[in-house]
Amino acid sequence: TPEVWVQVQMEATELSSFTVHCGFLGPGSISLVTVSWGGPDGAGGTKLAVLHPELGTRQWAPARQARWETQSSISLALEDSGASSPFANTTFCCKFASFPEGSWESCGSLPPSSDPGLSAPPTPVPILRAD
């Protein structure tokens, strides 16, 4: 069964910078990745980025840069301009649409005890549905 993993890390040098890493474990080719925060996309979450391997990438503030790391994983850099970081307690969700499997989504957040530079373990936390 395909799985999605989500990893959130705070940058050691910039406490206001976070990076979300997401990956798809399974066969098939990725057609679209949607990253959202505050919940799954379309279910209370707000879009942060959409990535397509050929058609391009798009991100929305506070996301700074979205890019492919491998053919099945992406990273999203976030910049927190506020004095206190809302990212620390936020859930980030990644939805991978793949052919022929359909859509798979998982969510993750920064562990409460995280030191800068440490990250949440890349454990898939399947939520919602596989369309």
Partner: antibody, heavy 119, light 107 residues
Framework: EAQLQQSGPELVKPGASVKISCKAS????????MNWVKQSHGKSLDWIGD????????TYNQKFKGKATLTVDKSSSTAYMELRSLTSEDSAVYYC????????????WGQGTSVIVSS | DIQMTQSPASLSASVGETVTITCQTS??????LAWYQQKQGKSPQLLVY???TLAEGVPSRFSGSRSGAQFSLKINSLQPEDFGSYYC?????????FGAGTKLELK
């Protein structure tokens, strides 16, 4: 077949405002963001911004903030752009253009609306 | 914002000739470069995206390539309907930015 039908040409006075429309047909209106692009006479293309018809959320090119306001009417599958405090610099052809995910390629284009600012 | 430097600004060629238009980007946009064609008095139309993928219905005489931050659009064996203006555009985030354009005229 996707089609974008824009409103007709406008001749407006300096300092006035103008609102141009773009009616979409042939596709699901909420599946594509609506972009607006400016083309001054004989010049290149300038992206003004886009709007998500599903929730009305818009993104603007910094240089057009305060100049353009993007709105949509889902019930009629129509997008609007209002331009305010018009000057001769705003005289141009304005295009609406629809883009599907990830909303960075301009897939379908309207025929353009000419706006001339003159006293 | 990502700056797009397109050259040449204008180009005269004859039917049957081969021409190349280039576009240089100020930042790394990976392969996310598109080309649009605009005929006189008409709307622009997507021609090529992701550096070299032809949009639906685009003839194979059009081809795109990349060398570092420089992207090229090549048109082999020019046809009468190919004359007009060409614009490059990155599709790596917003704001979307375009090159200044290349006007391809009949010699």
């Amino acid at each position: 077949e996707a089609q974008l039908q824009q409103s007709g040409p406008e001749l407006v006075k300096p300092g006035a405002s103008v609102k141009i429309s773009c009616k979409a047909s042939g596709y699901t209106f909420t599946d594509y963001y609506m972009n607006w692009v400016k083309q001054s006479h004989g010049k290149s293309l300038d992206w003004i911004g886009d709007i998500n018809p599903d929730n009305g959320g818009s993104t603007y090119n910094q240089k057009f903030k305060g100049k353009a306001t993007l709105t949509v009417d889902k019930s009629s599958s129509t997008a609007y752009m209002e331009l305010r405090s018009l000057t001769s610099e705003d005289s141009a052809v304005y295009y609406c253009s629809a883009s599907g995910p990830p909303y960075v390629l301009l897939d379908y284009w309207g025929q353009g609306t000419s706006v001339i600012v003159s006293s | 914002d990502i700056q797009m430097t397109q050259s040449p600004a204008s180009l005269s060629a004859s039917v049957g000739e081969t021409v190349t238009i280039t576009c240089q980007t100020s930042e790394n946009i990976y392969s996310y470069l598109a080309w649009y064609q605009q005929k006189q008095g008409k709307s622009p139309q997507l021609l090529v995206y992701n550096t070299q993928t032809l949009a639906e219905g685009v003839p194979s005489r059009f081809s795109g390539s990349r060398s570092g931050a420089q992207f090229s659009l090549k048109i082999n064996s020019l046809q009468p309907e190919d004359f007009g203006s060409y614009y490059c555009q990155h599709h790596y985030g917003v704001p979307l930015t375009f090159g200044a354009g290349t006007k391809l005229e009949l010699k």
